[in-house]
C-alpha cells in the first residue's frame, strides 16, 4: 500500500480467483484512543472498533472511503483505491490501446518544433468518475524538470456503437535548447483513477522522434503564361523552430484529381516553391517534414487548382 | 588541448554537399544494422545513448546559430570562453567563430572514423560475417574531413590483443551509429546555416 495523495491510498492487488488478497491496517488520525468505530462509504454498518482497523482487500467491493468516528463525529477518512495485477500484468482497463505506432500504445505525444513543448493525448470509453494526473521529466535516474498542465477533455467521437473520449495535456521542458542533441528521453507518467480503480501509464521518447510540423502556410498558386503549369509557393509554419536555415524543412507537393483513384503526381523539394501541372478539378497539397531527421510529415495544406 | 588551426574553404560549401552525403550514408548504415541485427538490441528505444565526443568536443555549442545564443538553456553547458565575449557574438560570422565550429566538427569526424575503423577490423574477424561497415560511409567521412581542410595529427587506430566479443561489438556498433546519426544531423543543420549566412 502506498499514498497517492493526502488520505488516498493505493492497494496493489495481485488478483486471481480465490486469491487471499492484501491485508491492510488503517489507523485513525486522532489522539483519541477509545470509543472509535469504522464505516465504509455511506453505509452505517460498523466494520470494527478501535484506533486501527485491519481489513482483507480481495476485490473492489473492499475498496472505498473508510471513516473513523467517535460519538457521531467524523475523525478521519482513508480512501482506498485498487491497482490490480492479473497474470503478472498491471491492468490497463481505463485507457484504450491506440495500436499506433505499435500495440500497447496508450499515450501518444507530438511536438510542433524543438522548443521542448509537446502535447500528449489518450483515449477512453469512460465518461464519468474519471481523473488524470500527469507528471513528466527528462530522464529518470537524475530527472530534469518538465512542467505539465492539467489534462482536459479535448474531443468526443462516436464510431458505430463506440463512444470515445480524447484527453490531452501540454507539457514544457523547463530549460530546453532547440539545438541540443538529446541523450536522455522525456518520460511521461499518467495516473488514471476511475471510481476506485487506479492505473498508471508511461511513455518515453525523444522530442526529435515525436516532431510533427504544422502544415505549410500561405499556400498560393501563380499561373505561368501560355502554360498549364503553375508555380506553387508556401511558407514555413509559424510554429516551426527558427532559424529556418538551421531547422530546415523538406516538402512534398502533390497534385490530386477529384477522384481518389486518379494517379497522384508528387514532387519533393527543399525549396518553398515548385512548378507543377494543374489539372482541371484537381487540388494541390503541400506537407512538410524535418529535412534532416525523418520524423512525421505534417498534415496537408491544400488549395484547389481552378 | 590545442584546437587545430583552421583554413576554412572560402566557398563554403562543398561541405554542405558532403554533409548531406554523410547523413544519407549513416542513416542507410543504421537502417542496415537494424535489419541485420534484428535480434540484438539495436533500436533507439533499446540502446543506451552514449556520445563518444562528450567532454572532448563541443560541436553543438560551438556551432550554435546566432539566434539561439540568446537562449539561456543553450548556453548552460558551454565551456568555451568566447561565448561571453560580446564582440564575438556580434560578429558571429568571423572566421574565428566559424573555425572553432568547423574544427569541432572535424574532431568529431576523426573520433568516429577511428572508432568505426577499429570496430570494422573486429567485425571482419567474426566467423558469422554478419555485418560490416559500409565502405561508402567511411569514404564520405573522409571526404568531409578533407573538405573541411584542417591539418591535425592523425590518431592511430586502436588495436586490441584480446579476443573480440562479437555480441558486444555489434551492440556497440548500434550505439555508435545512433549517436553518429544524431551528430550528422547537427552537422547538416550547421552546414545549411553557414551556407545560408
Amino acid at each position: 500500500i502506498w499514498e497517492l495523495k493526502k488520505d488516498v491510498y493505493v492497494v496493489e492487488l495481485d488478483w486471481y480467483p480465490d486469491a487471499p488478497g492484501e491485508m491492510v491496517v488503517l489507523t485513525c488520525d486522532t489522539p483519541e484512543e477509545d470509543g472509535i468505530t469504522w464505516t465504509l462509504d455511506q453505509s452505517s454498518e460498523v466494520l470494527g472498533s478501535g484506533k486501527t482497523l485491519t481489513i482483507q482487500v480481495k476485490e473492489f467491493g473492499d475498496a472505498g472511503q473508510y471513516t473513523c468516528h467517535k460519538g457521531g463525529e467524523v475523525l478521519s477518512h482513508s480512501l482506498l483505491l485498487l491497482h490490480k495485477k492479473e497474470d503478472g500484468i498491471w491492468s490497463t482497463d481505463i485507457l484504450k490501446d491506440q495500436k499506433e505506432p505499435k500495440n500497447k500504445t496508450f499515450l501518444r505525444c507530438e511536438a510542433k518544433n524543438y522548443s521542448g513543448r509537446f502535447t500528449c493525448w489518450w483515449l477512453t470509453t469512460i465518461s464519468t468518475d474519471l481523473t488524470f494526473s500527469v507528471k513528466s521529466s527528462r530522464g529518470s535516474s537524475d530527472p530534469q524538470g518538465v512542467t505539465c498542465g492539467a489534462a482536459t477533455l479535448s474531443a468526443e467521437r462516436v464510431r458505430g456503437d463506440n463512444k470515445e473520449y480524447e484527453y490531452s495535456v501540454e507539457c514544457q521542458e523547463d530549460s530546453a535548447c532547440p539545438a541540443a542533441e538529446e541523450s536522455l528521453p522525456i518520460e511521461v507518467m499518467v495516473d488514471a483513477v476511475h471510481k476506485l480503480k487506479y492505473e498508471n501509464y508511461t511513455s518515453s521518447f525523444f522530442i526529435r522522434d515525436i516532431i510533427k510540423p504544422d502544415p505549410p502556410k500561405n499556400l498560393q498558386l501563380k499561373p505561368l503564361k501560355n502554360s498549364r503549369q503553375v508555380e506553387v509557393s508556401w511558407e514555413y509554419p509559424d510554429t516551426w523552430s527558427t532559424p529556418h536555415s538551421y531547422f530546415s524543412l523538406t516538402f512534398c507537393v502533390q497534385v490530386q484529381g477529384k477522384s481518389k483513384r486518379e494517379k497522384k503526381d508528387r514532387v519533393f523539394t527543399d525549396k518553398t516553391s515548385a512548378t507543377v501541372i494543374c489539372r482541371k478539378n484537381a487540388s494541390i497539397s503541400v506537407r512538410a517534414q524535418d529535412r534532416y531527421y525523418s520524423s512525421s510529415w505534417s498534415e496537408w495544406a491544400s488549395v484547389p487548382c481552378s | 588541448r590545442n584546437l587545430p588551426v583552421a583554413t576554412p574553404d572560402p566557398g563554403m560549401f562543398p561541405c554542405l554537399h558532403h554533409s548531406q552525403n554523410l547523413l544519407r550514408a549513416v542513416s542507410n548504415m543504421l537502417q542496415k544494422a537494424r535489419q541485420t541485427l534484428e535480434f540484438y538490441p539495436c533500436t533507439s528505444e533499446e540502446i543506451d545513448h552514449e556520445d563518444i565526443t562528450k567532454d572532448k568536443t563541443s560541436t553543438v555549442e560551438a556551432c550554435l546559430p546566432l539566434e539561439l545564443t540568446k537562449n539561456e538553456s543553450c548556453l548552460n553547458s558551454r565551456e568555451t570562453s568566447f561565448i561571453t565575449n560580446g564582440s564575438c557574438l556580434a560578429s558571429r560570422k568571423t572566421s574565428f567563430m566559424m573555425a572553432l565550429c568547423l574544427s569541432s566538427i572535424y574532431e568529431d569526424l576523426k573520433m568516429y572514423q577511428v572508432e568505426f575503423k577499429t570496430m570494422n577490423a573486429k567485425l571482419l574477424m567474426d566467423p558469422k560475417r554478419q555485418i560490416f561497415l559500409d565502405q561508402n560511409m567511411l569514404a564520405v567521412i573522409d571526404e568531409l574531413m578533407q573538405a573541411l581542410n584542417f591539418n591535425s595529427e592523425t590518431v592511430p587506430q586502436k588495436s586490441s590483443l584480446e579476443e573480440p566479443d562479437f555480441y558486444k561489438t555489434k551492440i556497440k556498433l548500434c550505439i555508435l551509429l545512433h549517436a553518429f546519426r544524431i551528430r550528422a544531423v547537427t552537422i547538416d543543420r550547421v552546414m545549411s546555416y553557414l551556407n545560408a549566412s
Epitope: 480467483p17 476485490e59 473492489f60 467491493g61 470509453t125 456503437d161 463506440n162 463512444k163 471510481k195 476506485l196 | -
Partner: nanobody, 123 residues
Framework: EVQLVESGGGVVQAGESLRLSCAAS????????MGWFRQAPGMEREFAAA????????YYADSVKGRFTISRDNAKNTVYLQMSSLKPEDTAVYYC????????????????WGQGTQVTVSS
C-alpha cells in the same frame, strides 16, 4: 446508455440446469465487466458471478462456485449464466449488471441493470 435484457428464466426441478442470457446494447458495451446478481423474496440482492470485459477472467460467489459458469460472446454482445445442479435456495429473480470495476461483488460498483428474470427451483 447501456440497456440489458435478461431471458431464459423459468421453473425447473432441483438438480436440473438452466441457462440465462443477457443481451447488452448501447455504447461501448464490449468494454463493460458483466455480472449476475440475484434477489430472493424478502432478501437483499446478492452477487452470483462476474466476468471481465475481455472474457478471460471470472469470479464467483462461494454459494455458486462449481455449479454456475459465467461466459460472454462479445460478437453477440451477450453474457450467459449456465446454472447446473440447481437447488431450491437458488430460487430468485436474476439480474444482469454492467460496470467497470472487476472483480466486484458489490452491487454499487455496477452502473447498469436489467429488469431481471425469475428462476424457480422446486424440490
Amino acid at each position: 446508455e447501456v440497456q440489458l435484457v435478461e431471458s431464459g428464466g423459468g421453473v425447473v426441478q432441483a438438480g436440473e440446469s438452466l441457462r440465462l442470457s443477457c443481451a447488452a446494447s448501447g455504447y461501448n458495451v464490449k468494454d463493460y465487466e458483466m455480472g449476475w446478481f440475484r434477489q430472493a423474496p424478502g432478501m437483499e440482492r446478492e452477487f452470483a458471478a462476474a466476468i471481465s470485459w475481455r472474457g478471460s477472467s471470472t469470479y464467483y460467489a462461494d454459494s455458486v462456485k462449481g455449479r454456475f459458469t459465467i461466459s460472454r460472446d462479445n460478437a453477440k454482445n451477450t453474457v450467459y449464466l449456465q446454472m447446473s445442479s440447481l437447488k431450491p435456495e437458488d430460487t430468485a429473480v436474476y439480474y444482469c449488471a454492467a460496470g467497470r470495476l472487476y472483480p466486484s461483488s458489490r452491487s454499487r460498483d455496477y452502473d447498469y441493470w436489467g429488469q431481471g428474470t425469475q428462476v424457480t427451483v422446486s424440490s
